[in-house]
C-alpha cells in the first residue's frame, strides 16, 4: 500500500497525525463509521500534549473520542492500551450512569466543555474528531 505523507485538504496536521474536526453531531457509532470511511479513526488521546491540541480546536463543546466500553472493558478504537495509557476523566467519571432514562448506561467517552472526559449515552449526537497517522501504510487490500 501507499503511505500518506501529508494531510488531506481540511485536515489539521499535528505531531505526524492528521485531525479532522466535525462541525455537527452524530451518534458515536455513526461518527466511528464516518472516520473509517475517511480511512481514519476516532481520535485516540495518548498524551497531555495531544489532549491540549484537541481541546484547543474543539472548544467548549461535547465531542466524541475513540474510547468506549460497549463490550465490557474500556478500549481505544486503534488498540492502544487503555489501562497503561493517558487518561483525563472528570472527577468521579466514568460512572456508567443509568439515571438519564434513555435505557442502559453510558458506554462512550467524550470531551466535555472543559476538555476533561465523561462517559455518556452513545446515541447522543455529539461532534467528533477523526485522526489518521502520517507515514502509515494505507489499508488498501492487495489486488487479486
Amino acid at each position: 500500500g501507499s503511505e500518506r505523507t501529508c494531510c488531506p485538504v481540511n485536515w489539521v496536521e499535528h505531531e505526524r497525525s492528521c485531525y479532522w474536526f466535525s462541525r455537527s453531531g452524530k451518534a458515536w457509532a455513526d461518527a466511528d463509521n464516518y472516520c473509517r470511511l475517511e480511512d481514519a479513526h476516532l481520535v485516540v488521546v495518548t498524551s497531555w500534549e495531544e489532549q491540549k491540541f484537541v481541546q484547543h480546536h474543539i472548544g467548549p463543546v461535547n465531542t466524541w473520542m475513540g474510547l468506549h466500553d460497549q463490550n465490557g472493558p474500556w478500549k481505544w478504537v486503534d488498540g492502544t492500551d487503555y489501562e497503561t495509557g493517558f487518561k483525563n476523566w472528570r472527577p468521579e467519571q466514568p460512572d456508567d450512569w443509568y439515571g438519564h432514562g434513555l435505557g442502559g448506561g453510558e458506554d462512550c467517552a467524550h470531551f466535555t466543555d472543559d476538555g476533561r472526559w465523561n462517559d455518556d449515552v452513545c446515541q447522543r449526537p455529539y461532534r467528533w474528531v477523526c485522526e489518521t497517522e502520517l507515514d502509515k501504510a494505507s489499508q488498501e487490500p492487495p489486488l487479486l
Epitope: 457509532a29 470511511l37 489499508q139
Partner: antibody
C-alpha cells in the same frame, strides 16, 4: 473535467452474477469514498454500498448484504460492484457516486442498467 | 433504518413562483440532510448538503433550512429549468436513505 462512467450492466437471469465498473477521472480518486446507488424503473433512489478511499472500510444496505461486494482499484481509478445471486428486485439503473464531507453525493455517473429476468 | 418522507408528492407552479418542499425524517438527523434535483433520464444533481450548504455552481434561488426531523427546500423564483423532481437524503447514519421525491411541474 470531473467524470464518472459506469459500465457492465445488462440482462441476467435470476441467480446470476454481474460486475459493474465505474471509471473516475478529474479528481483524486484514492482520496475519496465512493458509493453505488440504484434506482428501479419508475421508483426512488436506494443507497447500495460505500467504500473508503483505500478500500479498507465497506458498508452495505441490508437488501444486498452477502450478495454484493464493493471494491476499488486505485491504480486504475476504478470502482466495482460484484453482484451475485441476483434477484428480480435488483433490476435498476445503477449509479456510482462520489461521497463528500457531508456524507452526500456530489458527483454522479450516468448510470448502467441491470435487468434481472428469466 | 431512518425513513424519509416528502410533501407534497407533486406540485404545479409557474415561472417566478416561490416554491417550498418539505422533507421529514423518522428520527433526529441534526443537519445531516442533502437535497438533489433529478430530471427525467438524468442522474441526480446535488443542490444542498448539511441541510443548508449550497453547492458550488447552484443558483442562489435555491436554499435549504431545518434541523432535527423537519427540513425545507425553497426555490425563491422558479425558472424554466427548475421543473424536475426534488429528492432529500439523510446522511446521518447507515443505511443512507432517500425520500420518495417531489415532482415539480408547470402549472
Amino acid at each position: 473535467e470531473v467524470q464518472l462512467l459506469e459500465s457492465g450492466g445488462g440482462l441476467v437471469q435470476p441467480g446470476g452474477s454481474l460486475r459493474l465498473s465505474c471509471a473516475a477521472s478529474g479528481f483524486t480518486f484514492s482520496s475519496n469514498a465512493m458509493s453505488w446507488v440504484r434506482q428501479a424503473p419508475g421508483k426512488g433512489l436506494e443507497w447500495v454500498s460505500v467504500i473508503s478511499g483505500s478500500g479498507g472500510s465497506t458498508y452495505y444496505a441490508d437488501s444486498v448484504k452477502g450478495r454484493f461486494t464493493i471494491s476499488r482499484d486505485n491504480s486504475k481509478n476504478t470502482l466495482y460492484l460484484q453482484m451475485n445471486s441476483l434477484r428480480a428486485e435488483d433490476t435498476a439503473l445503477y449509479y456510482c457516486a462520489k461521497r463528500n464531507y457531508d456524507d452526500a453525493f456530489d458527483i454522479w455517473g450516468q448510470g448502467t442498467m441491470v435487468t434481472v429476468s428469466s | 433504518d431512518i425513513q424519509m418522507t416528502q410533501s407534497p408528492s407533486s406540485v404545479s407552479a409557474s415561472v417566478g413562483d416561490r416554491v417550498t418542499i418539505t422533507c421529514r425524517a423518522s428520527q433526529n438527523i441534526t443537519t445531516w440532510l442533502a437535497w438533489y434535483q433529478q430530471k427525467p433520464g438524468k442522474a441526480p444533481k446535488l443542490l444542498i448538503s448539511a441541510a443548508s450548504s449550497l453547492q458550488s455552481g447552484v443558483p442562489s434561488r435555491f436554499s435549504g433550512s431545518g434541523s432535527g426531523t423537519d427540513f425545507t427546500l425553497t426555490i425563491s423564483s422558479l425558472q424554466p429549468e427548475d421543473f424536475a423532481t426534488y429528492i432529500c437524503q439523510q446522511a446521518n447514519s447507515f443505511p443512507f436513505t432517500f425520500g420518495p421525491g417531489t415532482k415539480l411541474d408547470i402549472k
